[in-house]
């Protein structure tokens, strides 16, 4: 995976929250749930109230990148999804407010959001070859592809 310094000269400025309170379901129709204070996992749910609701904030790159760059926050909290390394769980990082500017090593908070039909992919800005992924009997993590599942459906208006 790419070192953090790879993108350290690029600056990302917060624009606005573009989605509120949505659920992420993987290709097996498993919803992302919060198993504990720090990690996420995926499970097939009868009650979608158990699923994590996310907010998505958009950032603009100083190098005028065409990709949509986003931050993911658990709704009604100050917890932000943070990338680690390949096959490592993504963490929930607590911050008092959404960062106005992100650069250097803090790009582990950011993801490139790509959509292909109903499929959504979140690539780590800090590790551009790795995606947010679910993996059987494991936490939500960063992975390059199969056997991990890297495509998600966004479910909105689930209140």
């Amino acid at each position: 995976s790419a070192p953090f310094s790879f993108l350290s000269n690029v600056k990302y400025n917060f624009m606005r929250i573009i989605k509120y309170e949505f659920i992420l379901n993987d290709a097996l129709n498993q919803s992302i749930i919060r198993a504990n204070d720090q990690y996420l996992t995926a499970a097939a749910l009868h009650n979608l109230d158990e699923a994590v609701k996310f907010d998505m904030g958009a950032y603009k790159s100083s190098k005028d990148d065409a990709k949509i760059t986003v931050i993911l926050r658990i709704s009604k909290t100050q917890l932000y999804v943070t990338a680690q390394d390949e096959d490592q769980p993504v963490l929930l990082k607590e911050m008092p407010e959404i960062p106005k500017t992100i650069t250097g090593s803090e790009t582990n908070l950011l993801f490139f959001w790509e959509t292909h039909g109903t499929k959504n992919y979140f690539t780590s800005v800090a590790h551009p070859n790795l995606f947010i992924a679910t993996k059987q009997d494991y936490w939500v993590c960063l992975a390059g592809g199969p056997p991990s599942i890297t495509d998600f459906q966004i479910l909105e208006n689930q209140a």
Epitope: I33, N36, E50, A51, V52, I74
Partner: antibody, heavy 122, light 107 residues
């Protein structure tokens, strides 16, 4: 059907140890944390600890550090509470309770064991 | 830590009455408020989570409301089987404290 089944009542002498078990069924054990909650006679519910069922790591409330050990055997979906050097004030009902985050932001204990009464008396 | 203050500590009501219990948090808990029922000698049961959502199998006579720091639990028409102690609990931040409980009796 989701169930948490605890071991039976215990009568112990001061200074002894006790181990209480809580067997879970009806759900994926490692997808949800497990809590231990104490209710002393005539008292409120006190959350003693939370255990990460995936890693086995425990987070203790301040009053329950030292003589209390929380452990797991994930192969049989069971959580354990062990209390050493028992004192009369440990006399209480001990509950296990599954922890769940609703919407990822709001924590609740949605299923509870039937409780295990531990009596410490000489 | 967030403190939870529940009132009243006990109350007596007649079958068919509307019963209300309140719970106040020492700071904003963003609707992360749960209500539990504990019948004498029994295990606690989750009735309501996230302020107003009924847990599975809970009768519709139970309801919850509130926001910010102030929350209310209501039984619209008291039944004999509702004799119990009711606890609130905040689910916003550790250590997820319980209220002191309200013991409900039938007149």
């Amino acid at each position: 059907e989701i169930q948490l089944v605890q071991s039976g009542s215990e009568l112990k002498k001061p200074g002894a140890s006790v181990k209480v078990s809580c067997k879970a069924s009806g759900y994926t054990f490692t997808n949800y944390g497990m809590n231990w909650v104490r209710q002393a006679p005539g008292q409120d519910l006190e959350r003693m600890a939370w255990i990460n069922t995936y890693t086995g790591e425990s987070t203790y409330a301040d009053d329950f550090k030292g003589r209390f050990v929380f452990s797991l055997d994930t192969s049989v979906s069971t959580a354990y509470l062990q209390i050493s050097s028992l004192k009369a004030e440990d006399t209480a009902v001990y509950f296990c309770a599954r922890g769940i985050y609703y919407y990822g932001s709001s924590y609740a204990m949605d299923y509870w064991g039937q409780g295990t009464t531990v009596t410490v008396s000489s | 830590d967030i403190q939870m203050t529940q009132s009243p500590s006990s109350l007596s009501a007649s079958v068919g009455d509307r019963v209300t219990i309140t719970c106040r948090a020492s700071q904003d808990i963003s609707n992360c408020l749960n209500w539990y029922q504990q019948k004498p000698g029994k295990t606690p049961k989750l009735l309501i989570y996230y302020t107003s959502r009924l847990h599975s199998g809970v009768p519709s006579r139970f309801s919850g409301s509130g926001s910010g720091t102030d929350y209310t639990f209501t039984i619209s028409s008291l039944q004999p089987e509702d004799i119990a102690t009711y606890f609130c609990q905040q689910g916003k931040t550790l250590p997820y404290a319980f209220g002191q409980g309200t013991k409900l009796e039938i007149k």
